[in-house]
Interface confidence: low
């Protein structure tokens, strides 16, 4: 093709090409051609005729005035026609005649102010219709009944007006799925108007200034629809009352989007008519006080989003936000609820009872005082069977004990990113005889005892990055009693003290973070007793991280039991020379960094074992001295390994001798060198 | 190496209840969990739940909860799938599996037990 | 419960061809996502894990990529042997459901 077109399985793609005209020396055979953000002013029918095999064309974001009829017999097996961000502003009867096979069709953000006669008449498998950010100033696109098969239409950001009977009476025969209306300057709902909709699912009013009074009479004109999916973001909505949703009494209502509305009174019963609603998004309000009847009614809600939805007024204390108690008692088959980023004064007894089908809560950074977390604070969570709790972002600073004795379900704990600072005796976990994950990083220091897990042996991942650890080496160690964990991060604690027993018997560990801590001298053969081999018995160990440690020295059995090591992380420390035979046993190996040490010598005799199986490798920024015995069998390898090496040419560079300085490795010349061949 | 190997293939009646069997070899049974997954004639796989065969605990996909018990005999290396108030859709073959050292995979499967329910 | 999307349902290859096929989450399951080959009347076979690791004894034609909620599998350059039906499947939160299939067959 003398084009720039990329062509790839029957798709041609022929977009941003400053193009004037179609090209004709694509394939014949494409299904597929986007002609997008091009210079096209016209699309000449006789262009298309090689063509005929296009199911989807897209013209998009062209200067495009008009389209001739002839254009789609051209192109019988049209499918999808994309038009969007051209210059159409007249549309005939004439215009997609011959689109008669069209599922999709794209108008949206062009110069269409008017829909005259009928053009989608013909468009009898038509499923979207998109006429959005158009000029439009009623939803008038026909004077007959059409679109039977018409699911989605879209007419957001036009100048709509009013909703009448008269216009929407040509989808009688329809089922939409969708009917986006949103961005439109809707301030009239004419009696029968959805009505005149075979059956409509979704209807999408955001950014319309509705306003309370509004609200009211769409969900009269909405009573005995088929209405399951209802959006009102940002339409104004301040308050509600026992009547704003009355009308949606006569539907089976499943979703409803209150969203940004600024939402500030929530009257007791506004909800009640929505016995059927499963998915209700509440996010980013102003509610003051939710009372205690005001979500009566939502019974079958599983997912309710009230994030950002109480927020203080002023930084008086009498404006915090009030939640009654019993509020969320309505919500029984409540799974999902969000409730971050909010202004809430505390967690009452009887905040959360009701909820006996709730699984997953977040309250991360919702309260202006959760300082510490008592015996009481989650006693309304008693008979919820939740799996996942957020409470990060608190300023939780004390956990009492009993605190989580009231979640016997619970599974992943997450107390990360607080101000926690206190000793573990262990009772805080009381009662958490489920939990798989405890998140307790970046707090403000942890003191461990011996018996601060001992009550949750089923916990498999337990993350203490950054928490000022104290006491980690005790013995017997903290983490004896945690058999099944397979993930432990201790990152970041500028730990220097540890026994060679403090992870013994976590013989399931899959994953151990111990980067940015201070841990060099337990390797030192000159430490008080020799090494100490902290790593012994993990043999199921698959990720290793030791980097920014300051090891200057590794003993030579500190790896002898992880058989199953897959990734060994021991960048950023001070590392020289390897004993010969450390990677030995390490016959899994698949990424090993050991960028940014002083590493000279890359020998076989060390090397070998741990390069056999490598997919990964990174040895950055070491000062490699290029000699025949340093170095001539790694080079060798490199040149040879599939293994994948980032950065190879331009940070492996010869430290020494003088001569080779700066010189890249991997170009050292080995043919004078005996005995250097990497395979045998 | 590490095997699963299944009970043979059962034809019940609706209403009755089917004991799937999973025997496991060449690696400490009590170390891995050990899942059930479905998959109807023809159809996509569906995982039903997980047993810890260390200490039995499980965890039951909801839209099974009430119709199965997943069961573990230690001594010899076995674990049970029992569903019971069996319907016709019921019909599928029934696979266990198991969780690899890294927890996020299942690398080992059994060979399948077709269950058939039919009057 | 996080649903698993897959896509196409089916699709028709020739020996040789690259295929990708295409794996969403309804939520966030950040990697913990593998990718599944099973031929009629046999258990499914593992092919990628952790959403690209390839699994021991996978030809190297398979890869895996994506990350939260969107992930592909590629199969470079199709042989014989890879006409079956693959499966995705997350491993983030029980019930750890599967997509539900994408059939590949041969052109």
């Known amino acids: 093709s003398t084009t720039k077109c990329t062509v790839s399985h029957e798709v041609a793609d022929c977009s941003h090409l400053k193009l004037t005209q179609v090209p004709d020396d694509l394939p014949t055979n494409i299904t597929v051609l986007n002609l997008t953000h091009n210079q096209l002013r016209r699309l000449p029918a006789a262009n298309f005729t090689r063509y005929s095999q296009l199911t989807s064309l897209d013209v998009g974001f062209n200067t495009i005035s008009k389209l001739e009829p002839e254009l789609c017999q051209k192109l019988p097996m049209l499918k999808v026609l994309n038009l969007q961000h051209n210059e159409l502003s007249q549309l005939s009867d004439k215009t997609f005649a011959f689109c008669t096979n069209l599922t999709e069709l794209h108008l949206m953000s062009n110069s269409i102010q008017k829909i005259k006669n009928n053009p989608f008449v013909k468009q009898k498998n038509l499923i979207t219709l998109d006429l959005s950010h158009n000029g439009l100033s009623s939803t008038k696109l026909g004077t007959q009944v059409q679109l039977e098969n018409l699911q989605e239409l879209l007419l957001s950001n036009n100048k709509i007006q009013a909703l009448k009977s008269e216009e929407l009476d040509i989808f009688a025969n329809s089922s939409l799925k969708k009917l986006e209306l949103s961005s439109n300057q809707i301030k009239e709902f004419s009696p029968g108007c959805f009505h005149a909709i075979g059956r409509l699912f979704g209807l999408f009013l955001n950014n319309v200034q509705l306003g309370p009074s509004l609200t009211e009479k769409l969900c009269l004109e909405l009573a005995n629809t088929s209405i399951r999916n209802l959006s009102l973001s940002n339409s104004q909505l301040s308050t509600t009352s026992n009547t704003t949703f009355l009308g949606l009494k006569w539907t089976n209502l499943t979703m409803l989007d209150l969203s940004y509305n600024n939402l500030n009174v929530v009257g007791n019963d506004s909800f009640a008519w929505l016995p059927q609603l499963e998915y209700f998004f509440l996010e980013y309000n102003n509610i003051q006080h939710l009372f205690s009847h005001s979500l009566h009614g939502l019974f079958n809600v599983r997912y309710l989003n009230l994030k950002r939805s109480f927020t203080k007024q002023s930084i008086s204390l009498a404006s915090l936000p009030k939640i009654d108690d019993f509020s969320f008692q309505w919500l029984k088959c409540l799974e999902h609820l969000n409730m971050e980023d909010n202004d809430i004064p505390g967690i009452k007894s009887n905040m959360f009872t009701g909820l006996i089908n709730l699984k997953y809560l977040s309250l991360s950074n919702s309260f202006t005082s959760l300082r510490t977390l008592t015996n009481e604070t989650f006693v309304s969570l008693a008979h919820s069977p939740l799996h996942i709790l957020n409470l990060t972002k608190n300023k939780i600073s004390k956990i009492e004990s009993d605190a989580f004795s009231w979640l016997g379900h619970l599974e992943v704990l997450d107390l990360g990113l607080n101000e926690i600072g206190q000793e573990l005796t262990g009772q805080e976990w009381r009662g958490l005889e489920n939990i798989f994950e405890i998140y307790l990083s970046y707090n403000k220091y942890l003191q461990l005892t011996r018996n601060s897990f001992a009550l949750v042996p089923s916990l498999q991942r337990l993350m203490l990055r950054r928490v000022a650890l104290k006491n980690v080496d005790s013995s017997p160690s903290p983490f004896q009693p945690l058999r099944n964990l397979t993930i432990l991060d201790l990152s970041n604690n500028n730990i220097a003290n540890i026994n060679d027993d403090m992870l013994e018997g976590l013989e399931k560990l899959e994953i151990l973070d111990l980067q940015h801590n201070n841990l060099a001298r337990l390797w030192k053969h000159a430490n008080p007793g020799g090494p100490i081999y902290f790593l012994k018995g993990l043999s199921h160990l698959h990720i290793l991280n030791l980097e920014s440690n300051g090891f200057d020295e590794i003993p030579v059995e500190v790896f002898k039991d992880l058989f199953e090591l897959k990734i060994i992380d021991l960048g950023l420390n001070n590392l020289n020379t390897l004993p010969a035979s450390v990677f030995n046993n390490q016959v899994s190996l698949k990424s090993l960094n050991l960028q940014k040490n002083l590493i000279t010598s890359v020998e076989k005799k060390v090397f070998g074992p741990a390069f056999r199986n490598l997919t990964e490798l990174d040895m950055r920024f070491n000062p490699f001295d290029c000699t025949c015995e340093s170095i001539a069998w790694f080079v060798n390898w490199i040149n040879e390994t599939h293994t994948n090496i980032p950065e190879l040419s331009s940070h492996y560079l010869c430290n020494t001798p003088p001569h080779y300085h700066g010189f890249p490795v991997r170009l050292f010349d080995t043919s004078s060198c005996k005995d250097s061949a990497p395979f045998e | 190496q590490v095997q699963l190997v299944q009970s043979g293939a059962e034809v019940k009646k609706p209403g009755a209840s089917v004991k799937v069997s999973c025997k496991a070899s060449g690696y400490t049974f009590t170390t891995y969990w050990i899942h059930w997954v479905r998959q109807a004639p023809g159809q996509g796989l569906e995982w039903m739940g997980e047993?810890?065969?260390?200490?039995?605990?499980?965890n039951y996909n909801e839209k099974f909860k009430t119709r199965v018990t997943m069961t573990r005999d230690t001594s010899i290396s076995t674990a049970y799938m029992e569903l019971s108030r069996l319907r016709s859709d019921d019909t599928a073959v029934y696979y266990c599996a198991r969780v690899g050292v890294m927890i996020t995979t299942f690398p080992y499967w059994g060979q399948g037990t077709l269950v058939t329910v039919s009057s | 419960d996080i649903q698993m999307t897959q896509s196409p349902s089916s699709l028709s290859a020739s020996v040789g061809d690259r295929v990708t096929i295409t794996c969403r989450a309804s939520g966030n399951i950040h990697n913990y996502l593998a990718w599944y080959q099973q031929k009629p009347g046999k258990a499914p076979k593992l092919l990628i894990y952790?959403?690209?690791t390839l699994a021991d004894g996978v030809p190297s034609r398979f890869s895996g990529s994506g990350s939260g909620t969107d992930f592909t599998l590629t199969i470079s350059s199709l042989q014989p042997e890879d006409f079956a039906t693959y499966y995705c499947?997350?491993?983030?939160?029980?019930?750890?459901?599967f997509g539900q299939g994408t059939k590949l067959e041969i052109k």
């Open positions: 047993i810890n065969p260390n200490n039995g605990r499980i």
């Open positions: 499947q997350h491993f983030w939160s029980t019930p750890f459901t």
């Open positions: 952790n959403a690209k």
